[in-house]
């Protein structure tokens, strides 16, 4: 999701320089995050790209990646998850929607959830 | 006790170089991002420029971009500011300052005291 | 750019009484649930002082007497009760756009 959209930010030749200057210190801050599972609307990927550039940036200028593998975990169980829920549920989403998929960046029209699934209990 | 101690201002003419200088001392120098804020005759604050704490990522204000250079020396907790092709409007007290984060909100929590750059012919 | 607009450019507070100084952004400082809005202090002679950061947060070493609020493009420094060492000129910063822009300044003197 967070290479899909602004590419101004330049996430991912920025996130390689990061892990390569951190290397020796960070093993796993190379490993691209897997976000396959997710898809979110357009809005939501503007969200999620704007979030981690002000991660970037602020790691950049304390040159210090320890936070990110927590990062990306708290973007993949909880973020990721609010947004796709808030992206296929009202109001939101009415009847069907355009999600982009997190990995490949590509649109696919879908139907919105449920109301059962999306206000359990309701 | 947390200090900046600052040199190398001066009068120069339009055109001219002058390299400003920061000696940091009671914290991990290499720990912090710095930066430098000017204020003009008028008593107007302006960013200028930041570096990261290992001295790999550099920002400049567009003003400056192309004439200043920003550096660091971390074995001597010392930060730099390389400035050339001077204009009338470079005119300013120079301060270096320490860039901090709360969360994720930026600020100058430590400052140096200051040292005055003029630029006349 | 963000522009930094404070109000007023000087007042005068009586010593023991509120003295209250606005910013105005020209678009909001906020993101996700942070104001990245800060506040600092100058003496003559002196270089700026951090008195404030986050909109709301006392930096380490300064008087209760100071606090911050506000969201989104409005905030407010106050100073109650002020101090004969309060009388200095003020100044608000934005972080959450490149580049930090500073507001021009708020002069406070003390009756």
């Known amino acids: 999701c967070v290479f899909c959209r602004l590419p101004a930010h330049d996430l991912s030749g920025r996130l390689a320089r990061l892990c390569s200057q951190m290397e020796a210190r960070q093993k796993e801050c190379g490993a691209s995050p897997d976000f396959s599972a997710f898809a979110l609307d357009e809005v939501s990927m503007n969200k999620v790209t704007e979030k981690t550039h002000r991660v970037l940036r602020v790691m950049e200028i304390k040159e210090a990646v320890s936070s990110l593998p927590s990062y990306w975990s708290w973007l993949r169980k909880t973020k990721l998850p609010e947004y796709t829920r808030e992206a296929l549920c009202p109001p939101a989403c009415r009847g069907s929607t355009t999600l982009y998929n997190c990995s490949t960046c590509k649109g696919t029209e879908v139907s919105c959830w449920p109301r059962k699934r999306c206000f359990p209990g309701s | 006790e947390v200090k900046l101690q600052q040199s190398g201002g001066g009068l120069v003419k339009p055109g001219g170089s002058l390299k400003l200088s920061c000696a940091a001392s009671?914290?991990?120098?290499?720990?912090?991002?710095m930066s430098w804020v000017r204020q003009t005759p008028e008593k107007r604050l302006e960013w200028v420029a930041t570096?990261?704490?290992?001295?790999?990522?550099?920002y400049y204000t567009d003003s400056v971009k192309g004439r200043f250079t920003i550096s660091r020396d971390n074995a001597k907790n010392t930060l730099y500011l390389q400035m050339s092709s001077l204009r009338s409007e470079d005119t300013a007290m120079y301060y270096c300052?320490?860039?901090?984060?709360?969360?994720?909100?930026?600020?100058?929590?430590?400052w140096g005291a200051g040292t005055t750059v003029t630029v006349s012919s | 750019d963000i522009v930094m607009t404070q109000s007023p450019a000087s007042l005068a507070v009586s010593l023991g009484q509120r003295a209250t100084i606005s910013c105005k952004a020209s678009?909001?400082?906020?993101?996700?649930?942070?104001?990245?809005m800060n506040w600092y202090q100058q003496k003559p002679g002196q270089p700026p002082k951090l008195l404030i950061y986050?909109?709301?947060n006392l930096e380490s070493g300064i008087p209760a007497r100071f606090s911050g609020s506000g969201s989104g493009t409005d905030f407010t420094l106050n100073i109650h009760p002020v101090e004969e060492e309060d009388a200095a000129t003020y100044y608000c910063?934005?972080?959450?756009?490149?580049?930090?822009?500073f507001g021009g300044g708020t002069k406070l003197e003390i009756k």
């Open positions: 300052a320490r860039h901090n984060y709360g969360n994720y909100v930026g600020y100058f929590d430590v």
């Open positions: 570096i990261s704490s290992g001295g790999s990522y550099t």
């Open positions: 009671g914290f991990t120098f290499s720990s912090y991002a």
């Open positions: 910063q934005q972080s959450n756009e490149d580049p930090w822009t």
């Open positions: 986050a909109a709301s």
């Open positions: 678009q909001s400082v906020d993101y996700d649930g942070d104001s990245y």
